[in-house]
């Protein structure tokens, strides 16, 4: 996969480029997965609708000591205007579904690819 420089490059990158880089990073993670991703850690599943970037960050930020997703965590913080920290859950409703990080990444990747193809959200 081509590395576009993204967050390391000086100056702002277009939103479409940033999203493409996030997608590419998620592809990298899924393709390079040999052992269970993040030792099979479980995270809260999220609703893939408006606000999903912040929600994804809230979920993944609770996985510590997993270098494979550190870049994804950093990248997601650029898509969410709010400060998100470990242990923080902004949902008022009880979260009742936990899934493996690997499945979470796959679900997010499929959704982002779909959005990117369709070029729309709202």
């Amino acid at each position: 996969l081509t590395c576009l420089g993204g967050f390391a490059s000086p100056g702002p990158v277009p939103p479409s480029t940033a999203l493409r880089e996030l997608i590419e990073e998620l592809v990298n993670i899924t393709q390079n997965q040999k052992a269970p991703l993040c030792n099979g850690s479980m995270v809260w599943s999220i609703n893939l609708t408006a606000g999903m970037y912040c929600a994804a960050l809230e979920s993944l930020i609770n996985v510590s000591g997993c270098s494979a997703i550190e870049k994804t965590q950093r990248m997601l913080s650029g898509f969410c205007p709010h400060k998100v920290s470990a242990g923080q859950f902004s949902s008022l409703h009880v979260r009742d579904t936990k899934i493996e990080v690997a499945q979470f990444v796959k679900d997010l990747l499929l959704h982002l690819k779909k959005l990117f193809r369709e070029g729309q959200f709202n």
């Epitope: 702002p12 609708t49 408006a50 970037y53 929600a55 809230e58 650029g78 898509f79 959005l115 729309q120």
Partner: antibody, heavy 123, light 112 residues
């Protein structure tokens, strides 16, 4: 067309709570956020917080954390804001507005606004 | 918090004139992804604010082309090329690059 219909004017006593409502129509409620904004008489606008009805995720201006609680009911396409421990400083017009994001990120802007609810706190 | 400073506070104009409102932010509003989340709203007396311009220069649907937005970084301008009676009210700039989202103090456009 997009409409945000807010509940009527409220008169409340200091120390009590009120719950304001904002009923959305003309769009899919869960694919946008709802923000709340405060405007005191003759003054500017202050962002209180936002809720994403699709996930119930809420984000607050730290200034209003503990004062405002945002909720939503998907079945009726209605967002709510409860204001607690009311004082005269809470007397204001409160607007709900639709928070429009793009598929690129959760950054966005307020594209449609309700008509506002006037809250008067007085003993 | 990002402070948004609007000038002038009041802008008396004659109908048909051009009007220009300035908005300055206390820090850059450019996001690392390239977008600048600076927007303009008009609030007419007794009404709610209405979106005019989003992300610096994009006119919202139904907004006449006599309204235009420009600027970058920390300095932004809203221009109305030919003021009409329906344009009178208070104009607010707003930023949503940084949380909490903040608004300017408003500029009242009135008849000279």
């Amino acid at each position: 067309q997009v409409q945000l219909q807010q509940s009527g004017a409220e008169l409340a006593r200091p120390g009590t709570s009120v719950k304001l409502s904002c009923k959305a129509s003309g769009y899919t409620f869960t694919t946008y956020g709802i923000s709340w904004v405060k405007q005191r008489t003759g003054q500017g606008l202050e962002w209180i917080g936002e809720i994403y009805p699709g996930s119930y995720n809420t984000y607050y201006n730290e200034k209003f954390r503990g004062k405002a609680t945002l909720t939503a009911d998907k079945s009726s396409s209605t967002a709510y804001m409860q204001l607690s421990s009311l004082t005269s400083e809470d007397s204001a017009v409160y607007f709900c507005s639709r928070w429009r994001t793009s598929y690129f990120s959760d950054y966005g802007y307020f594209d449609y606004w309700g008509q506002g609810t006037t809250l008067t706190v007085s003993s | 918090d990002v402070v948004m400073t609007q000038t002038p506070l009041s802008l008396p104009v004659s109908l048909g004139d051009q009007a220009s409102i300035s908005c300055r932010s206390s820090q850059s509003l450019v996001h690392s992804h390239g977008n600048t989340y600076l927007h303009w709203y008009l609030q007419k007396p007794g009404q709610s604010p209405k979106l005019l311009i989003y992300t610096v220069s994009n006119r919202f649907s139904g907004v006449p082309d006599r309204f235009s937005g420009s600027g970058s970084g920390t300095d932004f301008t809203l221009k109305i090329s030919r003021v009409e009676a329906e344009d009178l009210g208070v104009y607010f700039c707003s930023q949503s690059t940084h949380v909490p989202y903040t608004f300017g103090g408003g500029t009242k456009l009135e008849i000279k």
